[in-house]
């Protein structure tokens, strides 16, 4: 899947831009926005009728290194009376983001971009139920 | 930056920290080509904290289109189909990282970009307090 | 700890309005949504109105539609609900609700009287 070229016509190719080797991009790993601080919403994983947990995947030859995966905790949902309801079901919400990822051939490091899937969290939903002759 | 192992037989010239600017092979290693929420699943119809799709465009962003949820209603839907306005149908927001061009325009330069995303939205049991 | 100052409650005649407002204070930082219940005697607490911080979506509850309306006032953390072409069935007790997505805040109440 390659990045699409900028192909609007009310583009302009500045004079300023870096020069490319053929077949690559440069890519700045300076994050925008990376000290920007967000208000999550407090333990929403714990409260949710669908609750989750979470694990820190780590891998030094990724960038970021630190991937944080979310896992139901159930299978069903958490009814009024804090019981698990298997009548319906507890289903992961995924997200896709972008990581570098450096490969290593011989002595030589190469940087390849990588599209990997996020769990973000779970929702309650209602299944489809389907009777099997 | 990150430390990462490094082959004991390779010249000691190799940074061990990923350098502020690399040069990317412009193939993304990627088996999830799916990006539409819509088509990947159902679930933003049959969750309990149903939500709507909106369609963030940018062309100097990769990728240029993100799909952000907005929940439905402020409660949840019970059993019977109605709103419970004593639950809460919440976003569940993340963080991800996308492409911006850098300078502006140029088709092969580009920086990361660390976005807030809401994903979908969950029911959530709020602790209640009487205020005196 | 947070706050909520509810006003505007009294007595009205049937066909006659009426603007509650209730200001939040203190630890009132990250709102998912500020709206009214209400409780009439002898009834369960019901939603009546209520208005999501982030986009100002509005939701009602079928029996107030097009007769309320609820606003805010962000820079005051104020929430306003006006409410026109008053009832007798719209006598009850408005309870001001401030939601933190897992925290809920209610307010102690307003009385709301609509009688000729």
């Known amino acids: 899947r390659k990045i699409p070229k900028v192909g609007h016509t009310f583009f302009q190719k500045p004079e300023s831009c870096p020069p490319v080797p053929g077949g690559s991009m440069k890519l700045d790993i300076g994050i925008i926005n990376e000290n920007q601080r967000v208000s999550m919403s407090r333990n929403i994983e714990s409260r949710s009728t669908s609750p989750w947990n979470y694990t820190v995947t780590w891998d030094p030859n990724r960038y970021p290194s630190e991937v944080v995966q979310a896992q139901c905790r159930n299978l069903g949902c958490i009814n009024a009376q804090g019981k698990e309801d298997i009548s319906m079901n507890s289903v992961p919400i995924q997200q896709e983001t972008l990581v570098v990822r450096r490969k290593h051939q011989g002595c030589s490091v190469s940087f390849q971009l990588e599209k990997v899937l996020v769990t973000v969290g779970c929702t309650c939903v209602t299944p489809v139920i389907h009777h099997v002759q | 930056g990150i430390t990462i192992p490094r082959n004991p037989g390779c010249p000691n010239s190799e940074d061990k920290n990923f350098p502020r600017t690399v040069m990317v092979n412009l193939n993304i290693h990627n088996r999830n080509t799916n990006t539409n929420p819509k088509r990947s699943s159902d679930y933003y119809n049959r969750s309990t904290s149903p939500w709507n799709l909106h369609r963030n465009e940018d062309p100097e962003r990769y990728p240029s289109v993100i799909w952000e949820a907005k929940c439905r209603h402020l409660g949840c839907i019970n059993a019977d189909g109605n709103v419970d306005y004593h639950m809460n149908s919440v976003p569940i927001q993340q963080e991800i990282l996308v492409l911006r061009r850098e300078p502006p325009h140029c088709p092969n330069s580009f920086r990361l970009e660390k976005i807030l995303v809401s994903v979908g939205c969950t029911c959530v049991t709020p602790i209640v307090h009487h205020v005196a | 700890e947070v706050q909520l100052v509810e006003s505007g409650g009294g007595s009205v005649q049937p066909g006659d309005s009426l603007r509650l407002s209730c200001a939040a204070s203190g630890r009132a930082n990250s709102i998912n949504w500020f709206g009214w219940f209400r409780q009439a005697p002898g009834k369960e607490r019901e939603f009546v109105a209520g208005?999501?911080?982030?986009?100002?979506?509005?939701e009602y509850a079928n029996s107030v539609k097009g007769r309320f309306t609820i606003s805010r006032d962000n820079s005051k953390n104020t929430v306003y609900l006006q409410m026109d072409s008053l009832r007798p069935e719209d006598t009850a007790v408005y309870y001001c609700?401030?939601?933190?997505?897992?925290?809920?805040?209610w307010g102690q109440g307003t009385l709301v009287t609509v009688s000729s």
């Open positions: 208005i999501r911080w982030s986009d100002a979506y509005t």
């Open positions: 609700v401030l939601d933190l997505s897992t925290v809920r805040y």
